[in-house]
Amino acid sequence: HPICEVSKVASHLEVNCDKRNLTALPPDLPKDTTILHLSENLLYTFSLATLMPYTRLTQLNLDRCELTKLQVDGTLPVLGTLDLSHNQLQSLPLLGQTLPALTVLDVSFNRLTSLPLGALRGLGELQELYLKGNELKTLPPGLLTPTPKLEKLSLANNNLTELPAGLLNGLENLDTLLLQENSLYTIPKGFFGSHLLPFAFLHGNPWLCNCEILYFRRWLQDNAENVYVWKQGVDVKAMTSNVASVQCDNSDKFPVYKYPGKGCPTLGDEGDTDLYDYYPEEDTEGDKVRATRTVVKFPTKAHTTPWGLFYSWSTASLDSQMPSSLHPTQESTKEQTTFPPRWTPNFTLHMESITFSKTPKSTTEPTPSPTTSEPVPEPAPNMTTLEPTPSPTTPEPTSEPAPSPTTPEPTSEPAPSPTTPEPTSEPAPSPTTPEPTPIPTIATSPTILVSATSLITPKSTFLTTTKPVSLLESTKKTIPELDQPPKLRGVLQGHLESSRNDPFLHPDFCCLLPL
């Protein structure tokens, strides 16, 4: 062929049109082409209908083609693998009717911000789905219902703050779940179902250790041998499990699986027998501290917000222990609570009202007659608007495991050093690859309004620690990509004093505690 390289390997006719500065499909490709490489061209838009004459096409690589639009028309009845990674797609094309035999779909490192409910409809043969490095914030609940054969799912390095409870329902073949480096703060009760998941990657999320994390804590305890940290250049089969990599963001990186859960409702408190799937509260040794707590019955379907607890769970008392977006039945009680010495509370916080702009109503009065405060859609006139001060952070290369123990990962990333072997088809970066440049992590969404009154504290504090979340991915030329954490605009009444050394404030939350 005058433009592309054609080679025959066994029964496969492979056509390589990579890096040819193509703006469209070259004419006169062999009709019996089975594998077509169109990587690193300048296609911008591409129509799958142009490939209909190639009836034996099983694999199509369209990665790094500056694609902003993929037109899905016609049918490619035997296409099994489609690589759309490293493009500029802002929406996932509806591929089901065009590609009914698709088994591997890679849309990593695009610009997807959301997925429609029927995004995967018709993709009943799909086994591997890679959505790493996009800008997804939420997922529709039935997203994966059309793909019951799914084995590998990567949602790593997105902006996910929550997951639908039934996301994994029916996925009996799922063996690898990559959720690392997102903005997840909890896992909904029952999320993992009763199916054993051999490989889970959950590190790099701001897990919020409060009473809602108990289901996840127990799952981690039960599956400690199946929780891993991805390391560049290491085959999945050679990785060592590390359940301690899943850490509480609001308590000095304490492992979630060890979270004591003190002050949380026990099965007898409210008679909700499946509150934590019968997962018992565990005792923690340490000095006893007298604490007041609110006994809370959590509605199982309530929408929650990551800022329901904005200081360390180690206080384990008080009404901010419960997520303020819920509508709990409350009963104020006093009881002996045991804490390790290092978690002894050093201030008391009483909330008369706390309102989140995302939630319809919120009741957090620590008396039997709760006060209900209405949502504040806009900042009140007397409020002080606060932006977190971004602190410069050095991005670290992040990566994910190969999609199966024997096959290389579809979208590769740079090895940490030139000498580290990388199990991918791409060359490792040469010694001259530039080091990552420090980039300030700038938070971008969501906006959260908080109004708080009657706060009693020895010292007012203001914390602006931002969690460095960065993503350095490499092509044949190194392109740094920054995965930015959510922006937080804390708006509280009253005047402020500034301090950075209170360990009980949520590190991602800018808190003003009025005198």
Epitope: L197, F199, Q221, D222, N223, V236
Partner: nanobody, 126 residues
Framework: EVQLVESGGGLVQPGGSLRLSCAAS????????MTWVRQAPGKGLEWVSA????????RYADSVKGRFTISRDNAKNTLYLQMNSLKPEDTAVYYC???????????????????RGQGTQVTVSS
């Protein structure tokens, strides 16, 4: 020292049922994921089922899905495999297995390297 002792095998007619047990000692059973594997005459080890340490997560080979049920009793340090609707092709020596410390568990790994008991023979024949 890790010890795994299987029992409950025997001769059964097609369509019949058996319940295998595995008594474990020498390690913290309640913290360990466990696996059943089997070896048919003249064949290699085949993964059958696995269960996580708390018993809340299970996984089955396609060939036994819907017929076999894995379970455990951590108070008794015992692993079970309930086998229903048995077929002649289920005939094999059944082993309970535990991966070694630091060993990666995955359906398809080399089961020879795992801790295993002496096995219990299951024969399905009319």
């Amino acid at each position: 020292e890790v010890q795994l002792v299987e029992s409950g095998g025997g001769l059964v007619q097609p369509g019949g049922s058996l319940r295998l047990s595995c008594a474990a000692s020498g390690f913290t059973f309640s913290s360990s994921a466990m696996t059943w594997v089997r070896q048919a005459p003249g064949k290699g080890l085949e993964w059958v089922s696995a269960i996580n340490s708390g018993g809340s997560g299970t996984r089955y080979a396609d060939s036994v899905k819907g017929r076999f049920t894995i379970s455990r009793d951590n108070a008794k340090n015992t692993l079970y495999l309930q086998m229903n609707s048995l077929k002649p092709e289920d005939t094999a020596v059944y082993y309970c297995a535990k991966r070694r410390d630091g060993q990666n568990w995955y359906p398809g790994i080399s089961y020879e390297s795992m801790y295993r008991g002496q096995g219990t023979q299951v024969t399905v024949s009319s």
